[in-house]
Amino acid sequence: SAPGEDEECGRVRDFVAKLANNTHQHIFNDLSGSVSLSWVGDSTGVILVLTTFQVPIFMITIGQSKLYRSEDYGKNFKDITDLINNTFIRSDFGIAIGPENSGKVVLTADVSGSHGSRIFRSSDFAKNFVQQELPFVPLMQIMYSPQNSDYLLALSNKNELWVSKNFGGKWEKLYDTVCLAKWGSDNTIFFTANHNGSCSNDRGMLELWRTSDLGKSFKTIGSKIYSFGLGGRFLFASVMTGKGTLRAIHVSTDQGDTWSMAQLPPVGHEQFYSILAANDDMVFMHVDEPGDSGFGTIFTSDDRGIVYSKSLERHLYTTTGGETDFTNVTSLRGVYITSILAEDKSVQSMITFDQGGRWTHLRKPENSKCDATARDPEKCSLHIHAAYSIATGLNVPMLPLSEPNAVGIVIAHGSVGDAISVMRPDVYISDDGGYSWTKALEGPHHYTILDSGGIIVAVEQNAHQGVNQIKFSTDEGQCWQTYNFTKDPIFFTGLASEPGARSMNISIWGYRSSLFHQYWISYTIDFKDILERNCEEKDYTIWLAHSTDPEDYEDGCILGYKEQFLRLRKSSVCQNGRDYVVTKQPSICLCSLEDFLCDFGYYRPENDSKCVEQPELKGHDLEFCLYGREEHLTTNGYRKIPGDKCQGGVNPVREVKDLKKKCTSNFLSPEKQNSKSNGSAGGSGGLNDIFEAQKIEWHE
């Protein structure tokens, strides 16, 4: 069972009075059907709330929206709809917040029946807005350059690519028949275009273009493109191979000047590739199995994105809605959780602590019993509910949650058995990055992390009854207190807290409804008086991440180094504060074979750390295409894992010789790549069917 809420369990004294003094109700007097909330800037306290009401009448949609602004983390709101001339703002991609702390906001208005559109833009955290007419109708949310918030990119509903260099004041058309466009690094724009005029029918016949000067000049960096994606420092393109409908992945680390063919299986038209996660060191790539299997294989790359090791087979990734449970546990380096589809068609959770090197089932929580799915009532695992469970309609209100500044903490819905259960899930918490788990709350909840883990807040999911209680824990979910934030329950719709988990404020959103009247309401609770004092040195203790064997000198070594953290003692009730920085001390480990992946032409037999030559390549020269040149590889089968920092110890030798021969795949050679100045290409629109799933870097 979950920890009790008894009188003595980590009880914070006088918390009811302290929270009552810091609970702020705001009633929104409008009847809108939906509400969306955006935080403007970091630590500014500014929140924009857009409420929208839409009614479809014949072929058109009549809509109305209201805009509210708070500058005290949601305690009070002011109706600022008049700043945007009471214009209807689209709820689907209406609010675009600028990167970092730019204070920039773009609202996209819905101007029905027009050939153009209208935006409202603010550079002062939504205090003032300037109206601007657009010469196009946006197809998706306007994209800010990550490097310069004055540079905006937009794709129109006619598949034209538009750019603005002065924060939306003036727009220039860059290109026609653009299917997909993305900002790269250094204000570079990548896009695919099709001169045949369609994006939906001619997948695989696209050209990949790049402009590094906001459209003054263009360069074709690829042809026969099916799709492309960016992940970390890698640019990926899936390219038709010339062998019927097969396509293969090509990778570039120099913005598309040179390409190498990734050592990954090619896929057919009914399959897909997906970058699950990427950083500057490596990539997790999912390769779909043939047929409508609903699963595929995860491969992990080397530091060039070229050589791949098989990481996890039967990885669940549905083709229908593109659901995968793949989750990066951001609170501990190297940890990822996902699901596999077992031979018996059951869905099971797996976890890796070493960036995909090895996967295991999640350890059963000590305070839990195996459910009915377990063949052996003593032996079972924790299974985590994520995107797949939500898509299948299970009562899972939230995805797994972790935050980089709340070290080691993972919160997730789960069930304990041989596989994921369709029964009502409970909330489980890990304080060590997923090595051990505890049942924290009975039944489904919404949850959030405040003050870098100093407080965890939860609200029970109750679809049929109103909600008037919030639960909170000051000891990482071991003990929970319950606070009634209102006498009259509300129909609860969600929790909102400032991204980054540094805030002490939580907003509970919902609505009240009667026969003739419905209105939105929010309760914002400030926990500053619960955590009365600032944390001091004595409130922190040492924690060795990834510790599994304290007697071992190499205990905690993952990817060649171990990390000691200063972590808040669970019993300390104090504020980490907004300026809290995670204190950690890395130390380098000796190299072992675990620090190396198998090189091109080698593989690891199951339960073996040695790399063995692939039988089909034995006795052959290992030659492969790299950066457009043929290379000869002399290796004893090992290559250091990307990001691995080990030194000394085992050190396998490796040498690559340039064969001075040119080679290309079905890709344009660098010398054949053409450039051209700005000019528009003909062709009519089409639909872009690439989508960005949550936390998924790229899905074809």
């Epitope: 003595e8 369990c9 203790t541 040492i542 510790s547 304290p550 007697e551 205990d555 200063l566 669970k570």
Partner: antibody
Framework: QVQLVQSGAEVKKPGSSVKVSCKAS????????ISWVRQAPGQGLEWMGR????????NYAQKFQGRVTITADKSTSTAYMELSSLRSEDTAVYYC???????????????WGQGTLVTVSS | DIQMTQSPSSLSASVGDRVTITCRAS??????LAWYQQKPEKAPKSLIY???SLQSGVPSRFSGSGSGTDFTLTISSLQPEDFATYYC?????????FGQGTRLEIK
């Protein structure tokens, strides 16, 4: 196997100082906090303070504040406890103790030194 | 400082007996309580942490319970090697404090 080996017994005059060492072997010294606990003859256990060697953070019980200094030398895997202005009631066995591994068990001492008897007598 | 009070201060029991030692904290310490066993001229040995979790290698006849301010250590069937002094320790807040000890003697 983790071992904490302490320096030998000391006889000190009132008003003087004593410095007791605690050398760790087996496992990694830097991975844990080291606490000092004393036990007067026939009495109970009394916590004096702790050090987190890798971060150089030391905390002391209020009772000993200003009189005790806990330090660590990472290169030799040794922790030190120095107690100044000694008085007869400081006569006790002084233990160093290491935190239990695991985040839920901090300041539960699973490894102890053999103890160092400090006698304060004029 | 949090005061830890053990009772009884001493008790006599026979091999095979069930023995319970209690420990009371002057304020709530959640479950941040440990128990130690100490034999004459030896360093203490950790038995239980987090109120009820057994240290590895400690026989299962030892168990702990409680929460908040009241805690107990139970030895289900006394063995000859169990005769010693037992201490509770709170690590909820600084300074860490110990109970005054319970001396368990052979009857």
């Amino acid at each position: 196997q983790v071992q904490l080996v302490q320096s030998g017994a000391e006889v000190k005059k009132p008003g003087s100082s004593v410095k007791v060492s605690c050398k760790a072997s087996g496992g990694t010294f830097s991975n844990y906090a080291i606490s000092w606990v004393r036990q007067a003859p026939g009495q109970g256990l009394e916590w004096m303070g702790r050090i987190i060697p890798i971060f150089g953070i030391a905390n002391y019980a209020q009772k000993f504040q200003g009189r005790v200094t806990i330090t660590a030398d990472k290169s030799t895997s040794t922790a030190y406890m120095e107690l100044s202005s000694l008085r007869s009631e400081d006569t006790a066995v002084y233990y160093c103790a290491r935190d239990r591994r695991g985040f839920s068990g901090y300041e539960v001492f699973d490894y102890w030194g053999q103890g160092t008897l400090v006698t304060v007598s004029s | 400082d949090i005061q830890m009070t053990q009772s009884p201060s001493s008790l006599s029991a026979s091999v095979g007996d069930r023995v319970t030692i209690t420990c009371r904290a002057s304020q709530g310490i959640s479950s941040w309580l440990a128990w130690y066993q100490q034999k004459p001229e030896k360093a203490p040995k950790s038995l239980i942490y987090a109120t009820s979790s057994l240290q590895s290698g400690v026989p299962s006849r030892f168990s702990g319970s409680g929460s908040g301010t009241d805690f107990t250590l139970t030895i289900s069937s006394l063995q000859p090697e169990d005769f010693a002094t037992y201490y509770c320790q709170q690590y909820n807040s600084y300074p860490i404090t110990f109970g005054q000890g319970t001396r368990l003697e052979i009857k």
